[in-house]
Interface confidence: low
C-alpha cells in the first residue's frame, strides 16, 4: 500500500541508514478496515520521518478500489493539521481558483487501473520533522463467486518500522468462512505473519510483519511487500431473511441457498471485424471454446458473428447437446475475420434469436435468457448512429432479458456500451487487452452462467419507505447477492417487512421477511453506533452509485436533476464522487496551488501518462501569480464564425469559397448558433446594441453574451466581454479576461488567453474560439463585444444545426451571371443553393480568429435578407428563450 520515497532538495548525497532512504523513513503504515454488514470502512495511516538536515520530498502513494469513495483525508505536520474539505466540484474550483488556472490536478494524481485507482500526493517535509497522512475510504462489498473480497494493495517501496493491516468484520448473520492471502509472500512466511480467526458474527485478520520479515533477503533494504493483500469471507445463510433495520434505515441482503440452477437460453454476439486480429481473436476463441465446454445439457444457445456482414451459427436456439457443442466449437475454431463493425446488425440478429422464444419456442420461455455481446471498436457498418442503435436495441429487447456488453481493449466507446447495457437490465465490463484476457472473459461468464431466479421483485410497505435503491432485478445468479437499502419513515421501523417474489426453475419463489426486533436490539448492543452509521452510509453509497449510473441514460433536464441529487448526497455523507472534490486547507505548492482530490473517470490515463507532478508545502502560503503559456493551438486557414454586427462567415472548403450573411435583430434576442441533438451540445449568443441608439438609423447589434453547454458532462460556460463563468447554473467560479488559464472539466478544456480569446475544446466534439473585442473606453456609443469561431467541427454529428452548425456539413451551391451591382466595387451574381435562386453580392468581411485585434479580410458572397434562402427556414426560427 502507501509509500514514502525521499528525494534530496540539494545536490548533496546522503548515505541511507537502517530503513531510511535518503534520510526519510516510514515509521508506521497501518490499514484498519472495519466491515459491518458488507459496508467496509478503511483508514490508512502513514507516518513518515525526515531525519535529514534539509527538506525532503516524500510521496504518499496508494491504490484503492475503483468502487470506493474517499471520505476523508488529513495531513499532520509539525503539529499542524491540514484537513480535507469536501465540496461540490465547482465550489472547490472557485475557492482554489489558482489550482484550476494552472490546469493541473494540483499535485494529487488520481489514475484509473483495472479494479484499483491510484492516489498519490507529494509533500515537502521539513528537516528533522515528521508528517502523518490519513486517508479514509468506504465501499460496499459485492458478493461474487460465493464470497466477499477485501483487496488492499500493498507497496510501501521501503521497509516500514510498524506495518499493520487489521481487518475487523462484523456480520449479523454469522460468518461461514474467512481466508486471507498475500500473493507476494512465500507460503511459510504468510503462515507466520497472517493471523485469521472467526467465530459467530465476528471475524478478524491481522497482518503485522516485522522489519526482518519484510526484507526481500536477510541483508536487503528492499521490501517484499508488493502486491495484493486479500481477505475473502462469506456469511451464514441458514436464515433466508437478512434484513437489517437501524436508525430509520434498512439494508436487505438477498442470496437464497439451495435453489436449482435454471436452464438458460444464451446467445453470444461476437465482433469479428479486422481490428480483432491477432491476440484478441485468439483469446476470444479460447474463451468461447472453454465456455461452450461448460454448458449444461438443459441450456440452449447460438452464436452470432458480426463484421461487415452478420452471420449466425444456427439462426435459432439449439440445445447444448454434446453433438451441438462439438459442432459449435468447430465453428468457433474455424471462423475468420471480416472488415467493418456492424454492431447494430449483430445485436439485432442476436435479439431476434432470443425473441423467437416468445414467438415460436414457448417451451423455452421458462428458461433464463441472456444476451452477451463482445466488441473491440465503434460501429462502422450498417446503422452507425449511436442513439439509433440504442433505440433499436431497446425496442427489440423490450425488457425481456438482460444484455451484457464486453468492451475489449481501449478503443471501444465504453460509455456507449454501459448505457446500452443499463437500458437493457445488464451491465458492461471492460476486458483489458492483456495476456489474461481469456481468463477475464471466462471470469465474466462464470458470474452469469448459473441463473437461479428471474424477475426478482423485492417489495417493502409503501407507506413505510421514503427512499429506496433498485428493487427489481432481471436475474439472480448463483454466488452473487442482491442488496436493497432505503430510508424508513418515523415510527415504521417495528412494522417493517420485505416481500420477495421471483420465478425459479419450475416454480414460483415467494418469501416474506419480518424485522426481528429483539435480534436488532442485540446487534445494536454489540456494535452500537457503528451499525447504525454503516447501515445509513450503505444506503447513501448505493443511492449515489445508482444516481450516477442513471445519469448516463437520461435527457439533459433529468440528468441535471439526478446530478443535483447525487451531489447533495455526496456532500451530506462526505463522499468524493465524480461530482465532488476534496480541497485540503492550509496546503499549497511553490506557486500557491492547493491540492484537490477528485474521483478519476473510467478512462483516466495510467499514471505514467499524467502531466508534471507538483510538490506541496505544508503552510498557508499566499498564492503567487502564475501564468501558463498561451494555448498555441494551430488554427485552420479559414474558419466559419460570426463577428461584429453579426456577420456570419461560412467557409465552404469544397468550393474554396466563403458565404456571408447578417442577422438584423433587436438587442436582447438570443440566437442558436450550434445545436447538436445527438449530444445536446449547444452554443447560443445574445445580442447587445450600442450604448446610445442613433435616431433614424439602423443601429449595429453584436454578440455580448455567449452560452456554451455540454449537458453530457454538466458543463456550462457563460462568456461576456467582462467575465467568463464556469457552470453559472451551479454558482460556479468566475474568471476575468485578465486571466491566463486552462480549465478542465470532464472532457472539456477551456483555455483563456489573457485579454485576447478563449478556446473551448470538447472531447469527441468540436473546438471553438471566442474572441474578445474591446472598444475605446471613452466611447459614448460602442461597447465591448464578442466574436465566435468554429475551429474544428468534423466530430460533430450530421444532425448538428443552428445558424452556424447547419454548415458543418457540405453545402452545394453554384454561382453564375456575375455582373456589376449598385456598388461598382462589389459585383452581384446569381447563386443557386438548396434549389433556390438568390441574388448575392461579393464583399469583404473581417475574420478575427487568428488576429483578435486587427482581423484578416475575407472575400465572400453576401446573402441578403438575413440569409434567406441559404439558412434552413427563417432566421427567426433560430431565436431561443435562454442562453443555455
Amino acid at each position: 500500500l502507501g509509500s514514502a520515497t525521499g528525494r534530496s532538495k540539494s545536490s548533496e548525497k546522503r548515505q541511507a541508514v537502517d530503513t531510511a532512504v535518503d534520510g526519510v523513513f516510514i515509521r508506521s503504515l497501518k490499514v484498519n478496515c472495519k466491515v459491518t454488514s458488507r459496508f467496509a470502512h478503511y483508514v490508512v495511516t502513514s507516518q513518515v520521518v525526515n531525519t535529514a538536515n534539509e527538506a525532503r520530498e516524500v510521496a504518499f502513494d496508494l491504490e484503492i478500489p475503483k468502487t470506493a469513495f474517499i471520505s476523508d483525508f488529513a495531513v499532520t505536520a509539525d503539529g499542524n493539521a491540514f484537513i480535507g474539505d469536501i465540496k461540490d466540484k465547482v465550489t472547490a474550483w472557485k475557492q482554489y481558483r489558482k489550482a484550476a488556472i494552472s490546469g493541473e490536478n494540483a499535485g494529487l494524481v488520481r489514475a484509473s487501473g483495472r479494479t484499483m485507482e491510484q492516489f498519490t500526493i507529494h509533500l515537502t517535509v521539513n528537516p528533522q520533522s515528521k508528517v502523518t497522512f490519513q486517508l479514509t475510504y468506504e465501499e460496499v462489498l459485492k458478493r461474487n463467486h460465493m464470497q466477499y473480497e477485501i483487496v488492499i494493495k500493498v507497496k510501501p517501496k521501503q521497509l516500514v518500522h510498524h506495518f499493520e493491516i487489521d481487518v475487523d468484520i462484523f456480520e449479523p448473520q454469522g460468518i461461514s468462512k474467512l481466508d486471507a492471502q498475500a500473493s507476494f509472500l512465500p507460503k511459510e512466511l504468510a503462515a507466520q505473519t497472517i493471523k485469521k480467526s472467526f467465530s459467530g458474527k465476528k471475524g478478524h485478520v491481522l497482518f503485522r510483519p516485522t522489519v526482518s520479515q519484510q526484507q526481500s533477503c536477510p541483508t536487503c533494504s528492499t521490501s517484499l511487500l508488493n502486491g495484493h493483500f486479500k481477505v475473502t469471507y462469506d456469511v451464514s445463510r441458514d436464515k433466508i431473511c437478512d434484513l437489517l433495520v437501524a436508525n430509520n434505515h434498512f439494508a436487505h441482503f438477498f442470496a437464497p441457498q439451495n435453489l436449482t440452477n435454471m436452464n438458460k437460453n444464451v446467445v453470444f454476439v461476437i465482433d469479428i471485424s479486422g481490428s480483432m486480429r491477432g491476440q484478441k481473436v485468439k483469446q476470444t476463441k479460447e474463451a468461447l471454446l472453454k465456455i461452450l465446454g461448460d454448458m449444461q445439457p438443459g441450456d440452449y444457445f447460438d452464436l452470432v458473428l458480426f463484421g461487415t456482414r452478420v452471420q449466425s451459427w444456427k439462426g435459432s436456439l439449439v440445445q447444448a447437446s454434446e453433438a451441438n457443442l462439438q459442432a459449435a466449437q468447430d465453428f468457433v475454431r474455424g471462423f475468420s475475420l471480416d472488415e467493418a463493425t456492424n454492431l447494430n446488425g449483430g445485436l439485432l440478429r442476436g435479439i431476434e434469436i432470443l425473441n423467437q422464444v416468445q414467438e415460436s419456442l414457448p417451451e423455452l420461455s421458462n428458461h433464463a435468457s441472456i444476451l452477451i455481446m463482445l466488441t473491440d471498436g465503434d460501429p462502422t457498418e450498417g446503422v452507425t448512429d449511436r442513439s439509433q442503435i440504442l433505440k433499436n436495441v431497446r425496442n427489440a429487447i423490450r425488457g425481456r432479458f438482460p444484455l451484457y456488453n464486453l468492451g475489449f481493449g481501449h478503443n471501444v466507446d465504453f460509455n456507449f456500451l454501459e448505457v446500452m447495457s443499463m437500458e437493457n437490465n445488464g451491465r458492461a465490463q471492460r476486458i483489458y487487452e492483456d495476456h489474461d484476457a481469456t481468463q477475464q472473459l471466462q471470469g465474466f461468464y462464470s458470474q452469469v452462467a448459473k441463473p437461479l431466479l428471474v424477475d426478482v421483485d423485492l417489495q417493502y410497505p409503501q407507506d413505510a419507505v421514503l427512499a429506496l435503491t433498485q428493487n427489481h432485478h432481471k436475474q439472480y445468479y448463483e454466488g452473487s447477492e442482491i442488496v436493497v437499502a432505503g430510508r424508513i419513515a418515523d415510527n415504521k421501523q417495528s412494522s417493517f417487512k420485505a416481500d420477495v417474489q421471483a420465478h425459479g426453475e419450475g416454480q414460483e419463489f415467494s418469501i416474506t421477511c419480518l424485522v426481528d426486533e429483539e435480534e436488532m436490539k442485540k446487534l445494536l448492543r454489540e456494535r452500537g453506533h457503528m451499525l447504525e452509521n454503516h447501515v445509513e452510509r450503505l444506503w447513501a453509497y448505493l443511492t449515489i452509485q445508482e444516481l450516477l449510473a442513471k445519469r448516463m441514460k437520461v435527457d439533459r433536464e433529468e440528468r441535471a436533476n439526478l446530478s443535483s441529487q447525487a451531489l447533495q448526497m455526496s456532500l451530506d455523507y462526505g463522499f468524493v464522487t465524480p461530482l465532488t472534490s476534496m480541497s485540503i486547507r492550509g496546503m499549497a505548492d511553490q506557486d500557491g496551488l492547493k491540492p484537490t482530490i477528485d474521483k478519476p473517470s473510467e478512462d483516466s490515463p495510467p499514471l505514467e501518462m499524467l502531466g508534471p507532478r507538483r510538490t506541496f508545502v505544508l503552510s498557508a502560503l499566499q498564492p503567487s501569480p502564475t501564468h501558463s503559456s498561451s494555448n498555441t493551438q494551430r488554427l485552420p486557414d479559414r474558419v466559419t464564425g460570426v463577428d461584429t454586427d453579426p456577420h456570419f462567415i461560412i467557409h465552404v472548403p469544397q468550393k474554396e469559397d466563403t458565404l456571408c450573411f447578417n442577422i438584423n435583430e433587436e438587442p436582447g434576442v438570443i440566437l442558436s448558433l450550434v445545436q447538436d441533438p445527438n449530444t445536446g451540445f449547444s452554443v447560443n449568443g445574445q445580442l447587445i446594441g450600442n450604448k446610445a441608439r442613433s435616431p433614424g438609423q439602423h443601429d449595429g447589434t453584436y454578440f455580448g453574451r455567449l452560452g456554451i453547454a455540454n449537458p453530457a458532462t454538466d458543463f456550462q460556460l457563460e462568456v461576456t466581454p467582462q467575465n467568463i463563468t464556469l457552470n453559472p447554473g451551479f454558482g460556479g467560479p468566475v474568471f476575468s479576461w485578465r486571466d491566463q488559464a486552462v480549465l478542465r472539466q470532464d472532457g472539456v478544456v477551456v483555455t483563456i488567453n489573457k485579454k485576447r480569446n478563449l478556446v473551448v475544446s470538447v472531447d469527441d466534439g468540436g473546438t471553438f474560439e471566442v474572441v474578445l473585442h474591446r472598444v475605446w473606453k471613452g466611447s459614448s456609443v460602442h461597447q465591448d463585444f464578442l466574436g465566435f469561431y468554429v475551429l474544428d467541427s468534423h466530430r460533430m454529428s450530421a444532425r448538428t444545426h443552428g445558424l452556424l452548425g447547419q454548415f458543418f456539413h457540405p453545402i452545394g451551391f453554384e454561382v453564375s451571371d456575375i455582373h456589376p451591382g449598385s456598388d461598382p466595387t462589389k459585383p452581384d451574381a446569381t447563386m443557386v443553393v438548396r434549389n433556390r435562386r438568390l441574388t448575392v453580392t461579393r464583399g469583404l468581411q473581417k475574420d478575427y480568429s487568428k488576429d483578435p485585434w486587427h482581423g484578416a479580410e475575407v472575400s465572400c458572397w453576401f446573402i441578403h435578407n438575413n440569409g434567406a434562402g441559404l439558412i434552413d427556414g427563417a432566421y427567426t426560427d433560430y431565436i431561443v428563450p435562454d442562453i443555455f
Epitope: 446488425g345 440478429r349 450498417g382 431497446r394 425496442n395 427489440a396 435527457d555 441533438p677 445527438n678 444532425r799
Partner: antibody, heavy 116, light 111 residues
Framework: EVQLQQSGAELVKPGTSVKMSCKAS????????MHWVRQRPGQGLEWIGD????????NYNEKFKSKATLTVDTSSSTAYMQLSSLTSEDSAVYYC?????????WGQGTTVTVSS | DIVLTQSPASLAVSLGQRATISCRAS??????????MHWYQQKPGQPPKLLIK???NLESGVPARFSGSGSGTDFTLNIHPVEEEDTATYYC?????????FGGGTKLEIK
Amino acid sequence: EVQLQQSGAELVKPGTSVKMSCKASGYTFTSYWMHWVRQRPGQGLEWIGDIYPGTDSTNYNEKFKSKATLTVDTSSSTAYMQLSSLTSEDSAVYYCSRSGDYYDYWGQGTTVTVSS
Amino acid sequence: DIVLTQSPASLAVSLGQRATISCRASQSVSTSSYSYMHWYQQKPGQPPKLLIKYASNLESGVPARFSGSGSGTDFTLNIHPVEEEDTATYYCQHSWEIPWTFGGGTKLEIK
C-alpha cells in the same frame, strides 16, 4: 396495453396554424421515438419526422422542415405536431406512430381540412 | 432519399390464390443478412397495421399466410391463400436512413 390517442378533426382556414396531439399510454413514453406520418385523401403515406421524448431530439423530412414542428410534454406523455401556414395541400389525415425501426402502434389519425 | 417503388399499383386475386407484391429500393437497405424493410396493411378509414418486419419476420398476431422475402433492393410480400378480409392497400417502408420512406402502395382486391 399500448395506446396512442390522437386529438379530434380540425377544420381550419388557409394561412393559419394547427396543433394536434397524440397521448401515449401503456409504455415508457421517453423510451421510444414518436413519428408523424401524413396521408392525403386517396394517396399514400409520407413520413414527416420523428421526435425522441427522452432527449427532445428531432429529425424532419426536408419537405416538411418549415411546415411542421414536433414537441413533447413528458409529464403528460403527449407528443404534439404544429403545422403552420396551412394551404389546401395540407388537408390530410395525420398519424402519430411509435417506432423502433418499424411502426408497431399507430394513433387513429387526426383529419385536418383546410378550407376558406 | 431512398425511393421505394411498389408494383403492381393494384392487383385482383381470386379467393384462395397467391397475391405477390413487389417493392424495389433505389439503393440497398440490407446488410449481408439483415434488411431494414417492413410491410403494412391499411384498410379504409384505419391506420396502417404492421405485418412483416425486417423483410421476413412475421409480426405477432399476424396470420401465417402472410410472408416476406428479399434483401438488398428487391423485396416481396406474399399472401397465400388470400382471404376476403385481405382486401386492403399494402405498403412497404424502409428504415435504413433518415428520411424513412414508404412505397406508393398496392391495392389488393379479392375476386
